[in-house]
Amino acid sequence: ELCDDDPPKITHATFKAVAYKEGTMLNCECKRGFRRIKSGSPYMLCTGNSSHSSWDNQCQCTSSAARNTTKQVTPQPEEQKERKTTEMQSQMQLADQVSLPGHCREPPPWENEATERIYHFVVGQTVYYQCVQGYRALHRGPAESVCKMTHGKTRWTQPQLICTGETEPSQFPGEEEPQASPDGLPESETSRLVTTTDFRIQTEVAATMETFIFTTEYQ
C-alpha cells in the first residue's frame, strides 16, 4: 500500500532509505534532452519472491533531438522546477550492502540518468535520519521513521532526533549510532532537506560504480 504522505521534517536533518520495501516505485523519467520511449514504463517497481527482490522494468530514453537514438538510463526524473541543490559525497559499497528480505537495494547509477530520483514508498518502509554537517544528534530514541497505516490513512512515525549546532556531523545508522540499522550510509550536508515520500536523490557516476555523488533537494 502506497504511503500517501511524507516522512516528518526534522530541522537540520536529512533522511535516507537504506533498502526499499517491495512495492516501492521509482519514477522512470529521463534527463534534459532525453525522453522516455512511448512504450516504456513510467516506473520501476521493487518486486520479488520469498528469496529475492529486484527492480522490475527497464527505463529506456531516447534523445529528444535524434528520434532513432535510444539509450538505457537509470530511472531518475528530471526536476519539475528549478531548485537549489547542494552536493554531498558518499562512499557506497554496493557489494557490502546487507540484503534485507523483501527489500530492494538502491538501483545503481547508469549513464545519462536524470537529475533526481523520486521514490514512492509503501507502508512498512523505514527511513533513517542524520543531522546535516555542522549539527550533532541528540537522541531520545531511534532516529528513524516508519510508514504505518491507521484507519485507511498513512502516516510516518516521529523520529526521536534533535540536531543541535555542533561542529561534528552525526552519521547514518550503523556509523556510530547503536540503536538503528547496521547498513546505513555516512553523509554530510549543509542545509535542511525537503523530506518527501517521493524522496529525491540526484546521482552521478563518480570514479567507480561504487562511489555516488548524491545531490539532494533543498528549499
Epitope: 500500500e1 502506497l2 500517501d4 497505516m149 485507511g152 490513512k153 528549499q219
Partner: antibody
C-alpha cells in the same frame, strides 16, 4: 468539518481549455495530497493524479499527463485542475478527493461538457 | 497498470437478500478498498483496508479477501443500498478502480 467544494458546471468548445477548482476547508490543506478522479457519463472512476499542495509536486496517471495540469494555491486552500485541448471524450464529471490514504472526503463533482 | 475486474456488472436483488460482489486484481495487491456511489452524487468510502468499515457504515456491509481476489458482502440488502459499488487499489500507481457493480431492484 472537512469540506471540498468544487466550481460549477462548464460547457466548453472543442479545442479550448477549462480550469476546475476545489476549495478545501476544515483541515490543514498542506497536510494532505489532493487527488483528482474522472467519471465519464455512465462510466466508472478513473484516477487522474494528485498534487502535494505544500510543494506543488504532482504525479499523474500517464493517460492524463498531456491532458491535465494540477496546481494548488496554499493561500486560498484551493486545488485546481486544468484540462487542455478539450475533445468530446473529455466530457465527464471531475472530482477532487482528499488523499493521505483512502479517499475519505470528496468534492461534489464538476460536470465539464465539451460540445460544438 | 493493475486491472480491476468486478463481477457482476449488474446485480438485481430484493430487500433482505444477501448480496456478494467480487473484485479481481490483475496483480497481487496489499488491500482492497470499496466505495458506494448513488446517481448524481460523489463516491462515498464504504470499506477500507479490505475489511474495515468506514465511519457510519452499517455492520451489514463486510469485506474480505487477499492477494488478487476480494469480496464485498451485504448480509441483508436494505432500500438505501441500491447503488453502484466500486473496488479500488492503491498499492501501485496508477491507482485504479473496478468498472463498478450496479445493485438494482429486482
Amino acid at each position: 468539518q472537512v469540506q471540498l467544494v468544487q466550481s460549477g458546471a462548464e460547457v466548453k468548445k472543442p479545442g479550448s481549455s477549462v480550469k476546475v477548482s476545489c476549495k478545501a476547508s476544515g483541515y490543514t490543506f498542506t497536510s494532505y495530497r489532493m487527488h483528482w478522479v474522472r467519471q465519464a457519463p455512465g462510466q466508472g472512476l478513473e484516477w487522474m493524479g494528485y498534487i502535494k499542495p505544500s510543494r506543488g509536486y504532482t504525479e499523474y496517471n500517464q493517460k492524463f499527463k498531456d491532458k491535465a495540469t494540477i496546481t494548488a494555491d496554499e493561500s486560498t486552500n484551493t486545488a485546481y485542475m486544468e484540462l487542455s485541448s478539450l475533445r468530446s471524450e473529455d466530457t465527464a464529471v471531475y472530482y477532487c478527493a482528499r488523499g493521505g490514504g483512502v479517499f475519505d472526503y470528496w468534492g461534489q463533482g464538476t460536470l465539464v461538457t465539451v460540445s460544438s | 497498470d493493475i486491472q480491476m475486474t468486478q463481477s457482476p456488472s449488474t446485480l438485481s436483488a430484493s430487500v433482505g437478500d444477501r448480496v456478494t460482489i467480487t473484485c479481481s486484481a490483475s496483480s497481487k495487491i496489499s488491500y482492497m478498498h470499496w466505495y458506494q456511489q448513488k446517481p448524481g452524487k460523489a463516491p462515498k468510502l464504504l470499506i477500507y483496508t479490505t475489511s474495515d468499515l468506514a465511519s457510519g457504515v452499517p455492520a451489514r456491509f463486510s469485506g474480505s479477501g487477499s492477494g488478487t481476489e476480494f469480496t464485498l458482502t451485504i448480509s441483508s440488502l436494505q432500500p438505501d443500498d441500491f447503488a453502484t459499488y466500486y473496488c479500488h487499489q492503491r498499492s501501485t500507481y496508477p491507482l485504479t478502480f473496478g468498472q463498478g457493480t450496479k445493485v438494482e431492484v429486482k
